[in-house]
């Protein structure tokens, strides 16, 4: 029977700069029941706070709701593991909410084959930003990436769409069924997961771009 091993805060993520969650890995438990607590203070403060919500983010997590999240503050946090034999502390982690944003995937992905009479046919892809993100405030610039592939292919073709929420693709294989997905990322932060795949059948008479 030993004191607990050193825990590690390995990830903090925010869906929208308004809330965020941090997760830690427990160290060894020393063969005894171990309690974990996350404490934090903000840069410029010495007032120590406890994690306000250990439930929302799942096991070994701390969730900071809207009222606990300040965009312009650096949070300095640490996890304490305690059992009957003693305590151990994680290293301090410095968290700036601006840099840990990982949005939800884009929504309402729509894919359509367009075959104008006077121009080459193309695949038209359109989507909406994730609901939690308010782009009107100007706090956010979201960048988008599209990936697509024929259903049975192994390799994805990736296109960077910049800030636009629609995109045209000209080079496609006629008669193939394609999978299309989109993801987004803030200017500082992490790529979202890919959206659920949308399938589109490319007509056999679709003319490849020269």
């Amino acid at each position: 029977q030993l004191p607990p091993g050193k825990p590690e805060i390995f990830k903090c993520r925010s869906p929208n700069k308004e809330t965020f969650t941090c997760w830690w890995r427990p160290g060894t438990d020393g063969g005894l029941p171990t309690n974990y607590s996350l404490t934090y203070h903000r840069e410029g403060e010495t007032l120590m706070h406890e994690c306000p919500d250990y439930i929302t983010g799942g096991p070994n997590s701390c969730h900071f709701g809207k009222q606990y999240t300040s965009m312009w503050r650096t949070y300095i946090m640490m996890v304490n593991a305690t059992n009957q034999m003693g305590s151990s502390f994680s290293d301090e982690l410095y968290v700036d909410v601006t840099y840990i944003v990982q949005p939800d995937p884009p929504l309402e992905l729509a894919v359509e084959v367009k075959q104008p009479e006077d121009r080459k046919p193309y695949l038209w892809i359109k989507w909406s930003p994730p609901t939690l993100i308010d782009l009107k405030t100007g706090w956010f610039t979201l960048l988008y990436e599209i990936r697509l592939k024929p259903e049975k292919a192994a390799e994805w073709e990736i296109h960077f769409a910049g800030q636009q929420t629609e995109f045209k693709i000209l080079s496609l294989h006629p008669g193939q069924k394609y999978l299309v997905q989109v993801r987004c990322k803030p200017d500082h932060g992490y790529w979202s997961a890919w959206s659920p795949a949308t399938f589109i059948q490319i007509p056999s008479d679709f003319t490849m771009n020269d």
Partner: antibody
Framework: EVQLVESGGGLVQPGGSLRLSCAAS????????MNWVRQAPGKGLEWISY????????YYADSIKGRFTIYRDNARNSLYLQMNSLRAEDTAIYYC???????????WGQGTMVTVSS | DIQMTQSPSSLSASVGDRVTITCRAS??????LAWYQQKPGKVPKLLIY???TLQSGVPSRFSGGGSGTDFTLTISSLQPEDVATYYC?????????FGGGTKVEIK
């Protein structure tokens, strides 16, 4: 409705004890840090104690250190202040106040009067 | 401990006047400063935090400024309902000290 209601005040002799309670409703009490602030008659506000959401971190003003104890019962949505060795200068209205996520007192109780006199 | 000094301790001004209250910290506190209003016989009410952020529901005639050691609370056009005592408070570390208060009256 978010509310804090203090009780337990009254008249007590110097050297005596009193326990103040603060009942919280309308919000998730266990997620919030809480404080006691007092105001002597005709005087300004004086912060006297802080307790973190799960009671692991506690701070006291020097004026009450060693005599007063703050504690909480999250299951009962209640905050307490155990006051021992009371002095005449402890006479005041005692407010409980919720600390918001950005560390300011956003919700206050109506206060309970404590009078220390022989 | 960091001391908070408010001035003036009281003032009297006319309706419509611009009123400024100052608060000085004995050491730098960045912008961890709040202002509260306490009307006679009432509970204190938060007006401003982070030195200049207006609390929801507070009239826009109230504004805060400053950083480090020197802070101000300004009422751009004094109204009869603004008669109260105003307190600054630092909240970057314990003790969460209040200033001594400024009593505002109407001439």
């Amino acid at each position: 409705e978010v509310q804090l209601v203090e009780s337990g005040g009254g008249l007590v002799q110097p050297g005596g004890s009193l326990r103040l309670s603060c009942a919280a409703s309308g919000f998730t009490f266990s997620s919030y840090e809480m404080n006691w602030v007092r105001q002597a008659p005709g005087k300004g506000l004086e912060w006297i104690s802080y307790i973190s959401s799960r009671g692991g971190t506690i701070y006291y003003a020097d004026s009450i250190k060693g005599r007063f104890t703050i504690y909480r019962d999250n299951a009962r949505n209640s905050l307490y202040l155990q006051m021992n060795s009371l002095r005449a200068e402890d006479t005041a209205i005692y407010y409980c106040a919720r600390l918001s996520g950005v560390d300011i007192f956003d919700i206050w109780g109506q206060g309970t009067m404590v009078t220390v006199s022989s | 401990d960091i001391q908070m000094t408010q001035s003036p301790s009281s003032l009297s001004a006319s309706v419509g006047d611009r009123v400024t209250i100052t608060c000085r910290a004995s050491q730098g506190i960045s912008n961890y400063l709040a202002w509260y209003q306490q009307k006679p016989g009432k509970v204190p009410k938060l007006l401003i935090y982070f030195a200049s952020t207006l609390q929801s529901g507070v009239p826009s005639r109230f504004s805060g400024g400053g950083s480090g050691t020197d802070f101000t609370l300004t009422i751009s056009s004094l109204q009869p309902e603004d008669v109260a005592t105003y307190y600054c408070q630092r909240y970057n570390s314990a003790p969460l000290t209040f200033g001594g208060g400024t009593k505002v009256e109407i001439k």
